[in-house]
C-alpha cells in the first residue's frame, strides 16, 4: 500500500524544513533497543565514544539516551498534501554535549561533541510505521535510516515499501 516515494516526496525537502522554535517540544530519557531486544550501548574508548548493539547480561543496566523532539513545518507544495504538514524530528544524546550524527559519506552513525545549534546531521525524522517501534530517518538524506548492521549502528538506504517495516531499522524506546 505504501510507496517509498511517498516518504521521499515528503522528506526530499528536509534540507529546507524549518524546525519550529529553537527549543524541543518535549524531551524523554529512554533506553534504546533493537526490534530483537538487543541494547544500544555507548562506550568511551580512546577519548571518543563507540556505539554497540549487544545482548546485555540479566541485571546489567541499560544505557539511557536523551531524546529531544522538535516540530518541523513543511509547506504544502513540498509535502504533496493540501495543507502545511507537521513532522517530528528528534536528536539523540547519550551523554552531555554528545549527539548521534549521520555520516552520510561513510554510511555510519557516530557520536560527535558539538554545541547548539546542532547541525542538520544530528536531526532525524521520527516514524512509527510498526507497532510500538520507531525509525529514525536522516534529515540530511531522505530515504536513509539508522539501522543495525554487523552489531553496529549504520545508515541504511530504504528503497522499497517492503523494507519500511524491516526489522533492522526498527527500534524500541523504554524507560526501564
Amino acid at each position: 500500500a505504501f510507496g517509498i516515494s511517498g516518504v521521499q516526496k515528503y522528506t526530499r525537502a528536509l534540507h529546507d524544513s524549518s524546525i519550529t522554535g529553537i527549543s524541543p517540544i518535549t524531551e524523554y530519557l529512554a533506553s534504546l533497543s533493537t526490534y530483537n531486544d538487543q541494547s544500544i550501548t555507548f562506550a568511551l574508548e580512546d577519548e571518543s565514544y563507540e556505539i554497540y548493539v549487544e545482548d546485555l547480561k540479566k541485571d546489567e543496566k541499560k544505557d539511557k539516551v536523551l531524546l529531544s523532539y522538535y516540530e518541523s513545518q513543511h509547506p504544502s507544495n513540498e509535502s504533496g498534501d493540501g495543507v502545511d504538514g507537521k513532522m517530528l524530528m528528534v536528536t539523540l544524546s547519550p551523554t552531555k554535549d554528545f549527539w548521534l550524527h549521520a555520516n552520510n559519506k561513510e554510511h555510519s552513525v557516530e557520536l560527535h561533541k558539538c554545541e547548539k545549534p546542532l547541525p542538520d546531521q544530528a536531526f532525524f525524522v521520527l516514524h512509527n510505521m510498526h507497532s510500538n517501534c520507531v525509525s529514525f530517518e536522516c534529515k540530511t538524506d531522505p530515504g536513509v535510516f539508522i539501522g543495525v548492521k554487523d552489531n553496529h549502528l549504520a545508515l541504511i538506504k530504504v528503497d522499497s515499501s517492503e523494507n519500511l517495516c524491516t526489522e533492522n531499522i526498527l527500534f524500541k524506546l523504554s524507560e526501564t
Epitope: F2, Y28, S79, D81, G82, G85, K86, L88, H130
Partner: antibody, heavy 121, light 107 residues
Framework: QVQLQESGPGLVKPSETLSLTCTVS????????VHWIRQPPGKGLEWIGV???????DYNSALMSRVTISVDTSKNQFSLKLSSVTAADTAVYYC???????????????WGQGTLVTVSS | DIQMTQSPSSLSASVGDRVTITCLAS??????LAWYQQKPGKSPKLLIY???RLADGVPSRFSGSGSGTDFTLTISSLQPEDFATYYC?????????FGQGTKVEIK
C-alpha cells in the same frame, strides 16, 4: 483542506460483518496514519485501530480477532471491517487522521463527522 | 494495555471559573497524551497534544501539563462554549486508549 467522511450501512444484522469506508481528501494517504474510533450511544470513545503510513495496522486487543483495517490508495479510501457483530457494536464510528507525518504521537486533529451503525435483526 | 483514568467523571462550574481535569495513566507514557473536547452530536476536537502543546485554533485559556503518568487539562476561565465532555488519550503504546471522559456542566 483535510477532509474525512465515513460511509456505510446504518443497519447491520447480528453475526454479520460491519463494513465502513472512510473517504479522504486534502492529504496523501501514504504520509499519515488513520484511526478508527467508535462511541456507543451515551458512552465514551473507544479506539478500534490504526493503519499507519507504512501500511501496518494495530488494533484494540479486545476487538483484534474481529477487526481489519485496510487502505485503497487508488480510491483515497480506508476501510473498516468488523465481523460477528452483536448489539454491543452499535455505535457512532469515526475515522481520524494523525497530526504528524508518519507517526501517531500528536493525536488526531482531523475527524470525520461519524456514522451511526445499529446492530439489530 | 495502558489504562487511562480521568477524574472527575463530571463537574458543575460557572462561566469564569477555573476548571481542572486530571488524567492518570497506569504506566508511564512520557508526554504522549492528547486532550479532546466533544459536544453532543459532534466529532471530538483536538485541544492539546504532546501533553502541553495547544492545537491550531484552540483558545489560550486551555492548557495542558504533566508527564509520565499524571496529566492535567486546565481551562483558566470557563466560557459558555466550553461546556462539553473532555477526553484524554495516550499515544505512547498501542492500543491507544482513551480516558472515560469528564462532562463539564453548567452550575
Amino acid at each position: 483542506q483535510v477532509q474525512l467522511q465515513e460511509s456505510g450501512p446504518g443497519l447491520v444484522k447480528p453475526s454479520e460483518t460491519l463494513s465502513l469506508t472512510c473517504t479522504v481528501s486534502g492529504f496523501s494517504l501514504t504520509n499519515y496514519g488513520v484511526h478508527w474510533i467508535r462511541q456507543p450511544p451515551g458512552k465514551g470513545l473507544e479506539w478500534i485501530g490504526v493503519i499507519r503510513a507504512g501500511g501496518s495496522s494495530d488494533y484494540n486487543s479486545a476487538l483484534m480477532s474481529r477487526v481489519t483495517i485496510s487502505v485503497d490508495t487508488s480510491k483515497n479510501q480506508f476501510s473498516l471491517k468488523l465481523s460477528s457483530v452483536t448489539a454491543a457494536d452499535t455505535a457512532v464510528y469515526y475515522c481520524a487522521r494523525d497530526h504528524y507525518f508518519s507517526n501517531s504521537y500528536g493525536g488526531s486533529p482531523y475527524w470525520g463527522q461519524g456514522t451511526l451503525v445499529t446492530v439489530s435483526s | 494495555d495502558i489504562q487511562m483514568t480521568q477524574s472527575p467523571s463530571s463537574l458543575s462550574a460557572s462561566v469564569g471559573d477555573r476548571v481542572t481535569i486530571t488524567c492518570l495513566a497506569s504506566q508511564t507514557i512520557a508526554t504522549w497524551l492528547a486532550w479532546y473536547q466533544q459536544k453532543p452530536g459532534k466529532s471530538p476536537k483536538l485541544l492539546i497534544y504532546a501533553a502541553t502543546r495547544l492545537a491550531d485554533g484552540v483558545p489560550s485559556r486551555f492548557s495542558g501539563s504533566g508527564s509520565g503518568t499524571d496529566f492535567t487539562l486546565t481551562i483558566s476561565s470557563l466560557q459558555p462554549e466550553d461546556f462539553a465532555t473532555y477526553y484524554c488519550q495516550q499515544l505512547y503504546n498501542t492500543p491507544y486508549t482513551f480516558g472515560q471522559g469528564t462532562k463539564v456542566e453548567i452550575k
